[in-house]
Structure formats: structure tokens, C-alpha cells
């Protein structure tokens, strides 16, 4: 079955609420040590307000202050640098809101973008120069935040230098990261410093650190992963899909639907037929006529399109494609003009002896 | 077909030194990590010196560190190893080898290897 | 340092045995392991890698698992030509071989 990004499911599906997660790039608040720092959570309509730093709940204390929507951090140091969250919880849902705070004497900046070079992964060893463990690449790890779609990938890089060579594992939420603490397990590539987690799931979410260490020191890097669950939704249909037809009486002709759905959905292809010369029965609802639906011998290319050969005038109307899944039901149009053959006389159009 | 050829090897006298090199084709040399690797007659294999795929660092296993010098020429795809101060226990068959395509998905193992060229240190 | 240990060093079976060679890491190497075929007077071929990976062009009989600290290359139907020594080598910070199974024929 053809597969949907998030970012189409937004604009196939304009009516639907846009996803309530922080996709992009969190807000980095900076501050020298000894400075105070104030945060204002930025959400709207929030009756509650709970606050995280680097995935653990955040409570008051001699130097952190909560009051209403706002975060005041007095007397900052380097502890206080971290990803902060504030949750609104609402009677019907949740948002919430990331940001950084990086409390240092010198700040860097960079893009966390795919590789392109892999020079700066490495730092030439002086094969007489021992040396505790040092990132080589710090722009690759910016970005801390990670808000991915459920069943794509994610990597994580701490790219590193130190001799003797030094070693990297890895922890979730402060505990050691087994294989077998996630289905599919994961991967490390130690030549790019990274851990890869391939099929997210809702299960992934938290905090993942690199751990880099070799005899001399030890150094570590805290990301947070938080997987964005695909809302379900009724079919989608493509646009413009079926589109409209015309043939002369004799030909063929063939509308085609393309069904895009999470949840396995039912076709039908529908033809609106008139009864007694009415379009329309007693309850308003129109009269239809059930022409093709997925079986148990049919594919699913077989249901997206619809064969009607030898056209008639009785052909000429209006059909339906109808998908529905456990979510709901979608359906598109299409008219078929049927055009007299070229030196035949106009046929007689018949009422359909078969209702449904 | 990925090709790895290593020369310069032969007999040496303790203490002196001798230069390996390896000329590389049927691949994007510059992408791959490289590395020499080591067999002592009738014994096990033995990592030896590691370059990453641009030259940017390299490391050593600690029997060899200030002595062996691996380097890399990417525009000539070569590999080179200076081995100073040799020891008796240096004896052995040489390979080169390919240590991971840096722009795959590929990792440090050692995908493809060089036929191996004997050094022997001796008086 | 990271330590591997291969079991057995020596290892005889008929063709047709399903072999089983064993590797131990003295600590969690994260499947970052290789397991490498080498025959009398050549240079080793690489067969696994990633623990379970079948690197291209190398027989389906051979397969890789294990994760942690416990790795086993299987060899489900023994043939002639498999007759060689086989070596695990981590590469999980830094390059580690193990000592080597040598396979013959009974």
C-alpha cells in the first residue's frame, strides 16, 4: 500500500489538526554563569504547565523558580545547560514546548546536517600525544532534539577524538542501551561516533547519551528522541482522481482511484443510477448501484481502477470510488460522457433493471 | 574488482627501517578508511596502524606507536606504511587493507585485503 | 583493552555437519564484529560482518549472531572447501582479532 510522509498528510488532509509536536530546531536561551535566566513557556491556552529538563520533571528549588507560565533560573551554571520542556495539558490534549539552555563562557553554533565531508569527524593523533577523549565535530551535535516520525530512522552522533582510541557507549535515560532492550535492536558506526535506531516507535522515546571514554577521561552527550505518532485518519484519495471521461458508444473506458490508507480500507466503485426517473429516493439519499468491490480473489491495483467496455448510452453518469477503513470514509467523482458513434443512430437509453 | 597490491617488503636488520606500500584500484579510494594488518608465521592476524579515509587521523596498536608511520596519498590511491626501528618480533606477512567506505553504511571492518608481502627482521 | 576469545582453537568435522565456532568478548562490543576465512598461503576474506551480515558473494551455509559479548558463525552444511581458520576481530573501539579456529575435515 502506497506510504505518506507526515508533511503529506498535512496537505492532503488540510481539515485535519496540524501535529502538536516541535518539529523544528528548539529555541536556545543563553547565559553566562552567575546570570539569571527567564524562560516563557510558549503555549497557548495552558491551563496546566509542567516542566522537564533533559526528560526529568522539573520542580522548584533555592534557584528555580516556577511561577504561571514562566521559568526563572537564578545564579546559572553550567549544570543548569540542557533541553527544557514545558508541557500544557489541556481536557482534550497536550502540547508541548522544547528549548535550550546553554549556560557556558563560549558558545558555538553550526547546523546538524547529513555528512557531506567526514574530515572534521577525525582530529590528527600524534601517535606520542595521549589524550583524554574531545568532540571533533560539535555542530553535529547541536541539535538535541530530535521529534521524528514514527517508523523512520534515527542517528545519533557524538563524534569524538583521544588516544588511545577511545570507546563510545551508549545509555537510555541514564541506563546502559542493550540490543535487546528495543525490538530490532540498533546499530553503532563506530567509524561516524554514531548510534542508529532504525523503525522508531512511541517505546524509543527519551534520552539517549553517548558515553565517550578512554583511559585519560571521559566525556558525554545527551540527546532526546521523542516520536511523533502518525494520527490516523480516514482514506486519502488522490486528487483529481477519478477524473472525468468521455467515449463514443462501442469504446472502452477506464477511471482509476488511488487509495492511500494506514488502516486496510474497503473499496468500492459506484455507479448513481436513476428509479422511476428519480436520482434520489424517498429519504433523499441518491440510488446506487454497487459495480465493483475488493474481494477476496481482487488486488488492491485491481480495485484502483475501473474497466467499462462496449460503452452505451445507459453507460453515462456518474461513478464513485468509496474507500473506507475503521477510521472513516472518503470518496471521489467522476462523470462519463457517452458520444454517439460516428453515422449510427442515437440509442434508446433503458431504465437499469438491477437496484441496489 | 577492487584491487589491493603491497610492495616493498624483504629482509631488514634489527634496528633499521623499511617503507610498505600499497596501490589501491577498483574503488573510490579516498572514501575508505584503510589499515595494515599483520601475521607472524604459523600465528594469528594482528591490527597494526589505522588512517581514516582523508588522512585526518590515524592510530596504532601500542607495540608499534612512534615507531610505524601510516600515511596516505588519495590523489595516487596509495598506502604506506614507514616502519622504523624494527624488531625481530616485527617478522611477518604485511597486508593492506580497506577499512570501511566512510560515505555508506559501511563500518571498520576490513572488506577487502592485499595478498600480503613478508618483512623479516633479522641479522 | 578489549579481549577476544575464539573456542575451539581446533575444530574437526565431516561434510555435511552443521559447524559451530564460538567468539567471547571481554566486554559488550555492540555486534561490531567481523568473522574473516582463511585458507592455507592466502590472505583472509572477510564473511560476516555487523555480527549477522552476510558480506556479498559468500554462501548462504555461513551465517552470523550473537550480540553483546557472545558472537557464533554457523556453517550449516560443511563442504570440502570450508576447510581453513576462521578468526573473529572486533571493531568497536580499535581492532581486536581473536586466536583463530582451525577447521579440517575428519
Known amino acids: 500500500r502506497p506510504s505518506f510522509s507526515l508533511v503529506e498528510d498535512t496537505t492532503l488532509e488540510p481539515e485535519e489538526p496540524p501535529t502538536k509536536y516541535q518539529i523544528s530546531q528548539p529555541e536556545v536561551y543563553v547565559a553566562a554563569p552567575g546570570e539569571s535566566l527567564e524562560v516563557r513557556c510558549l503555549l497557548k491556552d495552558a491551563a496546566v504547565i509542567s516542566w522537564t529538563k533533559d526528560g526529568v520533571h522539573l520542580g522548584p528549588n533555592n534557584r528555580t523558580v516556577l511561577i504561571g507560565e514562566y521559568l526563572q533560573i537564578k545564579g546559572a551554571t553550567p549544570r543548569d545547560s540542557g533541553l527544557y520542556a514545558c508541557t500544557a495539558s489541556r481536557t482534550v490534549d497536550s502540547e508541548t514546548w522544547y528549548f535550550m539552555v546553554n549556560v557556558t563562557d563560549a558558545i558555538s553554533s553550526g547546523d546538524d546536517e547529513d555528512d557531506t565531508d567526514g574530515a572534521e569527524d577525525f582530529v590528527s593523533e600524534n601517535s606520542n600525544n595521549k589524550r583524554a577523549p574531545y568532540w571533533t565535530n560539535t555542530e553535529k551535535m547541536e541539535k538535541r532534539l530530535h521529534a521524528v516520525p514514527a517508523a523512520n530512522t534515527v542517528k545519533f552522533r557524538c563524534p569524538a577524538g583521544g588516544n588511545p582510541m577511545p570507546t563510545m557507549r551508549w545509555l537510555k535515560n541514564g541506563k546502559e542501551f542493550k540490543q535487546e532492550h528495543r525490538i530490532g535492536g540498533y546499530k553503532v558506526r563506530n567509524q561516524h561516533w554514531s548510534l542508529i535506531m532504525e523503525s522508531v516507535v512511541p517505546s524509543d522515546k527519551g534520552n539517549y547519551t553517548c558515553v565517550v571514554e578512554n583511559e585519560y577521561g571521559s566525556i558525554n552527550h545527551t540527546y532526546h528522541l521523542d516520536v511523533v505518532e502518525r494520527s490516523p485518519h480516514r482514506p486519502i484519495l488522490q486528487a483529481g482522481l477519478p477524473a472525468n471521461a468521455s467515449t463514443v458508444v462501442g469504446g472502452d473506458v477506464e477511471f482509476v482511484c488511488k487509495v492511500y490508507s494506514d488502516a486496510q480500507p474497503h473499496i468500492q466503485w459506484i455507479k448513481h443510477v436513476e428509479k422511476n426517473g428519480s436520482k434520489y429516493g424517498p429519504d433523499g439519499l441518491p440510488y446506487l448501484k454497487v459495480l465493483k468491490a475488493a474481494g477476496v480473489n481482487t488486488t488492491d491495483k485491481e480495485i484502483e481502477v475501473l474497466y467499462i467496455r462496449n460503452v452505451t448510452f445507459e453507460d453515462a453518469g456518474e461513478y464513485t470510488c468509496l474507500a473506507g477503513n475503521s477510521i472513516g470514509i472518503s470518496f471521489h467523482s467522476a462523470w462519463l460522457t457517452v458520444l454517439p458513434a460516428p453515422g449510427r443512430e442515437k440509442e434508446i437509453t433503458a431504465s437499469p433493471d438491477y437496484l441496489e | 574488482e577492487v584491487q589491493l597490491v603491497e610492495s616493498g617488503g624483504g629482509l631488514v636488520q634489527p634496528g633499521r627501517s623499511m617503507k610498505l606500500s600499497c596501490a589501491a584500484s577498483?574503488?573510490?579510494?579516498?572514501?575508505?578508511?584503510m589499515a595494515w594488518v599483520r601475521q607472524a608465521p604459523k600465528k594469528g592476524l594482528e591490527w597494526v596502524a589505522f588512517?581514516?579515509?582523508?588522512?585526518?587521523?590515524?592510530y596504532y596498536r601500542d607495540s608499534v606507536e612512534g615507531r610505524f608511520i601510516i600515511s596516505r596519498d588519495n590523489a595516487k590511491s596509495t598506502l604506506s606504511l614507514q616502519m622504523d626501528s624494527l624488531r625481530s618480533e616485527d617478522t611477518a606477512t604485511y597486508y593492506c587493507t580497506t577499512a570501511g567506505d566512510y560515505y555508506s553504511d559501511n563500518d571498520w571492518y576490513f572488506d577487502f585485503w592485499g595478498p600480503g608481502i613478508m618483512v623479516t627482521v633479522s641479522s | 583493552d578489549i579481549q577476544m576469545t575464539q573456542s575451539p582453537s581446533l575444530l574437526s568435522a565431516s561434510v555435511g555437519d552443521r559447524v559451530t565456532l564460538s567468539c567471547k568478548a571481554s566486554q559488550s562490543i555492540y555486534n561490531s564484529l567481523a568473522w574473516y576465512q582463511q585458507k592455507l598461503g592466502e590472505a583472509p576474506k572477510l564473511l560476516i560482518y555487523?555480527?549477522?551480515s552476510l558480506q556479498t558473494g559468500i554462501p548462504s551455509r555461513f551465517s552470523g549472531s550473537g550480540s553483546g559479548t557472545d558472537y557464533t558463525l554457523t556453517i550449516s552444511s560443511l563442504q570440502p572447501e570450508d576447510v581453513a581458520t576462521y578468526f573473529c576481530q572486533k571493531y568497536y573501539s580499535g581492532w581486536t582479532f581473536g586466536g583463530g579456529t582451525k577447521l579440517e575435515l575428519k
Open positions: 577498483g574503488l573510490t579510494f579516498s572514501n575508505y578508511g
Open positions: 588512517i581514516s579515509h582523508d588522512g585526518g587521523s590515524s
Open positions: 555487523d555480527a549477522d
